[in-house]
Amino acid sequence: VKVLHEPSCFSDYISTSVCQWKMDHPTNCSAELRLSYQLDFMGSENHTCVPENREDSVCVCSMPIDDAVEADVYQLDLWAGQQLLWSGSFQPSKHVKPRTPGNLTVHPNISHTWLLMWTNPYPTENHLHSELTYMVNVSNDNDPEDFKVYNVTYMGPTLRLAASTLKSGASYSARVRAWAQTYNSTWSDWSPSTTWLNYYEPWEQHLPHHHHHHHH
């Protein structure tokens, strides 16, 4: 039993670290392997993670961890029964993969714009809450060549989009992902897409009905 690609781990820096590795042959990860992890700190408990298969020889382990701090270092040991296959350390703050932004919605806004909004995946007290910047991908559902990428480097999880920059009458999808520059993180996974129809002439006809009541 041999490890082909040694474990690579990422932390969401709040509750979970995920390690992935590849064995040199197809392996029933949950039956044959265990990943033990222990905070490198006096009196810390040793924990065991039961890996799952992703592919026939790729194993993934999700480890619940406490709210991370920069000094945290975990000792990792990969076991096949009594045989130690690999040993290494993991510092969550150096391998951050942010959580996926949530609840992406699109709303008609004043001045012929669409307002895209989503939620920051971290509570305000977490280090990453104020560190995230975002990438928004907007694509035409029927034209793969028609797509735009927006970098949202300001704090608020919103993006204003001029309807005139998109084709009228076309269906568009948007998705968003996050990055923590200070931590030199990897990108988060993309959020689920949200889809809308882009009409901008005449704009008023395409506002949600409850907006019209304000004019009476």
Partner: antibody, heavy 115, light 107 residues
């Protein structure tokens, strides 16, 4: 020796469906994933998804979720990919391959979508 | 999705020369990178996996290097049979993705 033998070329009309096959031999079929890859003329490679023959579990590239359905028949050690609602964009060579990274490939099936 | 960018789509190199093909990932792929050689009408052939490990039967003039987001395939003392298209492939993150390919021609 490990072999992946794919079905022959297909010419189909827009809107139709087609089922491509990949017959595996020379190893225990249920042990390894089978992946499918698309290559349009003069273009790069696109990963469609994989199926794990032991339990039929699939993972798709989001882009192909509505386009492709992967299945296997363990009794004949054959993997299948059905492509739906075909358009000219689906005209390509489709390869099956065993387990990432892809050390074993089928010879490819050429699909032409034309009226 | 992780984008894989091969900076050159075409390279013309002298027989016996050296060629270097680069591949840049849009995010970390932790060395889960493979290189393939493909000749017209054929399926790709795996040359290198894990960024640096040469597959059995692949000549030693091929080598792979890199880490993080940046990877390189090198071919020294180029032979006529090395004329082909070379693809990089990340298999770290789903969906797996490929570079656009680099066609190597022998002068």
């Amino acid at each position: 020796q490990v072999q992946l033998q794919q079905s022959g070329p297909e010419l189909v009309k827009p809107g139709a469906s087609v089922k491509l096959s990949c017959k595996a031999s020379g190893y225990t079929f249920t042990t390894y994933d089978i992946h499918w890859v698309k290559q349009r003329p003069g273009q790069g490679l696109e990963w469609i998804g994989w199926i794990y023959p032991r339990d039929g579990r699939t993972t798709y590239n989001e882009k192909f979720k509505a386009k492709a359905t992967l299945t296997v028949d363990t009794s004949s050690t054959t993997a299948y990919m059905e492509l739906h609602s075909l358009t000219s964009e689906d005209s390509a060579v489709y390869f099956c391959a065993r387990s990432s990274p892809f050390g074993y490939w089928g010879q490819g099936t050429t699909l032409t979508v034309s009226s | 999705d992780i984008q894989m960018t091969q900076s050159s789509s075409y390279l013309s190199v002298s027989l016996g020369g050296r060629v270097t093909i680069t591949c840049k990932a849009s995010d970390h792929i932790n060395n889960w990178l493979a290189w393939y050689q493909q000749k017209p009408g054929n399926a790709p052939r795996l040359l290198i996996s894990g960024a640096t490990s040469l597959e059995t039967g692949v000549p030693s003039r091929f080598s792979g290097s890199g880490s993080g987001k940046d990877y390189t395939l090198s071919i020294t003392s180029l032979q006529t049979e090395d004329a082909a298209t070379y693809h990089c492939h990340q298999y770290w993150s789903i969906p797996y993705t490929f570079g656009g390919g680099t066609k190597v021609e022998i002068k």
